[in-house]
């Protein structure tokens, strides 16, 4: 495969990775698998710093993350460890809310519009924010 | 000129399998992902599968789902679905199409038939 | 899976007539939807995407409108090359889904 040097168009560059931001609403599935048809992931949130970044780029407005507990614990799409890494949880989130009435809990986390984190319906048709590291092999399969 | 040019149809028995091509031109082929989409004699149109610019992620119809196989060489601009297990139900006119940022199809090619039957 | 459902099916009109075409998603797609024109024997061509975005190089007499789950395609004034049939498609959510068509003929 071939490596990414540089960040596509309309993606924005910082700390070695490229960041796409979404103008429009998906549920959390649905935008895991556009960041993936990117050859992205959904953001995975590492440090204060990318936070900030973020959070700078997003403004006040409900955005989703990589992050989920759909499977029981807590998990970033990437595979970053969740329970040694960063974490900006709204007070008393995540709180797998069932009042809401939609049926279940809140399995998804998403930027709430202060930038700190809550966990919320995975259906909801929030924005997103896909991200793609620079300088990984592009994973181009070998044809058969 | 941006182009995309399908290759590979013809007549098959149920059972069968069969390889589409895609020829792509004009346009930077492995920054886009790419799609198949199909349309049966005097019917509408139906999203098969799509693949990402790199080809590391992939997904499908139910209706295929196991049965074919979308791919792409990115080094000769082209891309590519494999077919097989084929039914009565498979025939029709198979286009490729790149796919946008907003989720839709931009430039499609002429298409090319498949049909299915004994 | 998105069902998307058109009206009318098919529609007989003249030239320079105001031609309206609706699709509804049964659920909401917000703006995810663009809708295709084909002729026969031809490859569909996007007139518009995001709901109500022109593609480049379409006639502006083509508009779009809606968001949620009901959409409207628009002609505003029908030219001789405009009789095709009409498709929308939503890309909001796997799998993407056609509608079933609208074939816009001569009165």
């Known amino acids: 495969g071939s490596e990414r040097t540089c960040c596509p168009v309309n993606w924005v560059e910082h700390e070695r990775s490229c960041y796409w931001f979404s103008r429009s609403g998906k549920a959390w599935a649905d935008a895991d698998n556009y960041c993936r048809l990117e050859d992205a992931h959904l953001v995975v949130v590492t440090s204060w710093e990318e936070q900030k970044f973020v959070q700078h780029h997003i403004g006040p407005v409900n955005t989703w993350m990589g992050l989920h507990d759909q499977n029981g614990p807590w998990k970033w799409v990437d595979g970053t460890d969740y329970e040694t890494g960063f974490k900006n949880w709204r007070p008393e989130q995540p709180d797998d809310w069932y009042g809401h009435g939609l049926g279940g809990g809140e399995d998804c986390a998403h930027f709430t519009d202060d930038g700190r984190w809550n966990d919320d319906v995975c259906q909801r048709p929030y924005r997103w924010v896909c991200e793609t590291e620079l300088d990984k092999a592009s994973q181009e399969p070998p044809l058969l | 000129e941006v182009q995309l040019l399908e290759s590979g149809g013809g007549l098959v028995q149920p059972g069968g399998s069969l390889r589409l091509s895609c020829a792509a031109s004009?346009?930077?082929?492995?920054?886009?992902?790419m799609s198949w989409v199909r349309q049966a004699p005097g019917k509408g149109l139906e999203w098969v599968s799509v693949?990402?610019?790199?080809?590391?992620?992939?997904f499908y119809a139910d209706s295929v789902k196991g049965r074919f196989t979308i791919s792409r060489d990115n080094s000769k601009n082209t891309l590519f679905l494999q077919m097989n297990s084929l039914r009565a139900e498979d025939t029709a006119v198979y286009y490729c199409?790149?796919?946008?940022?907003?989720?839709?199809?931009?430039?499609w090619g002429q298409g090319t038939m498949v049909t299915v039957s004994s | 899976d998105i069902q998307m459902t058109q009206s009318p099916s098919s529609v007989s009109a003249s030239v320079g007539d105001r031609v309206t075409i609706t699709c509804r998603a049964s659920?909401?797609?917000?703006?995810?939807l663009a809708w295709y024109q084909q002729k026969p024997g031809k490859a569909p061509k996007l007139l518009i995407y995001?709901?109500?975005s022109l593609q480049s190089g379409v006639p502006s007499r083509f508009s779009g409108s809606g968001s949620g789950t009901d959409f409207t395609l628009t002609i505003s004034s029908l030219q001789p090359e405009d009789f095709a049939t009409y498709y929308c498609?939503?890309?909001?959510?796997?799998?993407?889904?056609f509608g079933p068509g609208t074939k816009v003929d001569i009165k």
């Open positions: 199409a790149k796919r946008t940022p907003e989720d839709v199809f931009d430039i």
């Open positions: 004009g346009f930077t082929f492995s920054s886009y992902a």
């Open positions: 693949i990402s610019g790199s080809g590391g992620s992939t």
């Open positions: 659920q909401g797609i917000i703006s995810w």
């Open positions: 995001a709901a109500s």
């Open positions: 498609q939503q890309g909001n959510s796997f799998p993407f889904t």
